[in-house]
């Protein structure tokens, strides 16, 4: 049975005999971040039973994690490159505070968590170069982010574990939606 790169296998990028286009570079970059998320999810799932928990909805209500919807212009029906790109960049900027929260949540994968955070910053820069409509991109308020971070860190252990699991799962899905949408651009 085929085993593709995924939650349980490592991808090795194929060698290139020619330079990548900016779109291909972004594609590979997102794949690299997804590898990192995959590793972090492994540690989270091994450490707790959050990945099988049915109580996700309880914790999810307290989080406002970016999610792709049809109105964002990233789906095939009603696809709009500018609207979609704004949604992707805005969403990534909103995820930054959650990625900051993850920084102290891992023991054996501390470097991996840092790599995911730094690679996301680089991805945002790549995409900002691609975006024409930069005025429409709203950057989260630093004070709002700071108070959200404090609030998340003040949760009990179970909620912190659940929050970690939900951030990783949502970020993975958001990046997968991005990957698919960016291939249309």
């Amino acid at each position: 049975a085929p085993v593709l790169p995924g939650e349980d296998s490592k991808n090795v990028a194929a060698p290139h005999s020619q330079p990548l286009t900016s779109s291909e570079r972004i594609d590979k970059h997102i794949r690299y971040i997804l590898d990192g998320i995959s590793a972090l999810r492994k540690e989270t799932c091994n450490r707790s039973n959050m990945c099988e928990s049915s109580k996700e909805a309880l914790a999810e209500n307290n989080l406002n994690l970016p999610k792709m919807a049809e109105k964002d212009g990233c789906f095939q029906s009603g696809f709009n490159e500018d609207t979609c790109l704004v949604k992707i960049i805005t969403g990534l900027l909103e995820f930054e505070v959650y990625l900051e929260y993850l920084q102290n949540r891992f023991e054996s994968s501390e470097e991996q968590a840092r790599a995911v955070q730094m690679s996301t910053k680089v991805l945002i820069q790549f995409l900002q170069k691609k975006a024409k409509n930069l005025d429409a991109i709203t950057t989260p308020e630093p004070t709002t982010n700071a108070s959200l971070l404090t609030k998340l860190q003040a949760q009990n252990q179970w909620l912190q574990d659940m929050t970690t699991h939900l951030i990783l799962r949502s970020f993975k899905e958001f990046l997968q939606s991005n990957l698919r949408a960016l291939r249309q651009m």
Epitope: A1, P2, L4, P5, G6, E7, N11, A13, A14, P15, H16, Q18, L20, T21, E24, R31, L34, D35, S38, M68, F75, Q76, S77, R169, K172, E173, Q176, S177, L179, R180, R183, Q184
Partner: antibody
Framework: QVTLKESGPVLVKPTETLTLTCTVS??????????VGWIRQPPGKALEWLAH???????RYNSALKSRLTISKDTSKSQVVLTMTNMDPVDTATYYC??????????????WGQGTLVTVSS | DIQMTQSPSSLSASVGDRVTITCRAS??????LHWYQQKPGKAPKLLIY???QSISGVPSRFSGSGSGTDFTLTISSLQPEDFATYYC?????????FGQGTKVEIK
């Protein structure tokens, strides 16, 4: 293990609508990054991608056939349905459903059903 | 649409032979090229993905190479079970397109 199974009529008349169902097991249609697609192969000819549907209900169609195709899914039943209107004898083919995607939302098919031969004839 | 052209369309070879199949894309698809094997009356089976990545369970005699527009599938030492039709697929952009197939027959 991952399996996909196609079901539907073996014979349809010209101008009729074909409805094919793909029932999957071993993975969930709601797992992010995943999708299910339909590919057909006329006897003795090459493969032709028709359509697919992603985990979040985003859909893709072969532009040459788009006006005739509709793809949908029922996650609770683990089923993906393809309908193709105004069937013609040239649509006679083996119709396959296949799993697509994965962590990188790969544009490839890693598991296939065994296929169902659909003949269009009056 | 990106056209995928395979050559040859068929070939005859003996067990133990080294077999090379080529696939050309009408425009650059980077390494987003996948290979499938299909035996008569059976569904296709994924053989190689992203031009050169091997699939777990696929014998090591199968290898792929190439990037951009020109790709190659190589069977280093043909075995009796390798007699089949091989297809390349554009996995770069929509619509996904396949080559017309290369039938590998017994000499």
């Amino acid at each position: 293990q991952v399996t996909l199974k196609e079901s539907g009529p073996v014979l349809v008349k010209p101008t009729e609508t074909l409805t094919l169902t793909c029932t999957v097991s071993g993975f969930s249609l709601s797992t992010s990054g995943m999708g299910v697609g339909w590919i057909r192969q006329p006897p003795g000819k090459a493969l032709e991608w028709l359509a697919h549907i992603w985990w979040d209900d985003d859909k893709r169609y072969n532009s040459a056939l788009k006006s005739r195709l509709t793809i949908s899914k029922d996650t609770s039943k683990s089923q993906v349905v393809l309908t193709m209107t105004n069937m013609d004898p040239v649509d006679t083919a083996t119709y396959y459903c296949a799993r697509i995607g994965g962590l990188y939302v790969d544009y490839l098919m890693d598991y296939w059903g065994q296929g169902t031969l659909v003949t269009v004839s009056s | 649409d990106i056209q995928m052209t395979q050559s040859p369309s068929s070939l005859s070879a003996s067990v133990g032979d080294r077999v090379t199949i080529t696939c050309r894309a009408s425009q650059s698809i980077s390494d987003y090229l996948h290979w499938y094997q299909q035996k008569p009356g059976k569904a296709p089976k994924l053989l190689i993905y992203y031009a050169s990545q091997s699939i777990s369970g696929v014998p090591s005699r199968f290898s792929g190479s190439g990037s951009g527009t020109d790709f190659t599938l190589t069977i280093s030492s043909l075995q009796p079970e390798d007699f089949a039709t091989y297809y390349c697929q554009n996995g770069h952009s929509f619509p996904w397109t396949f080559g017309q197939g290369t039938k590998v027959e017994i000499k």
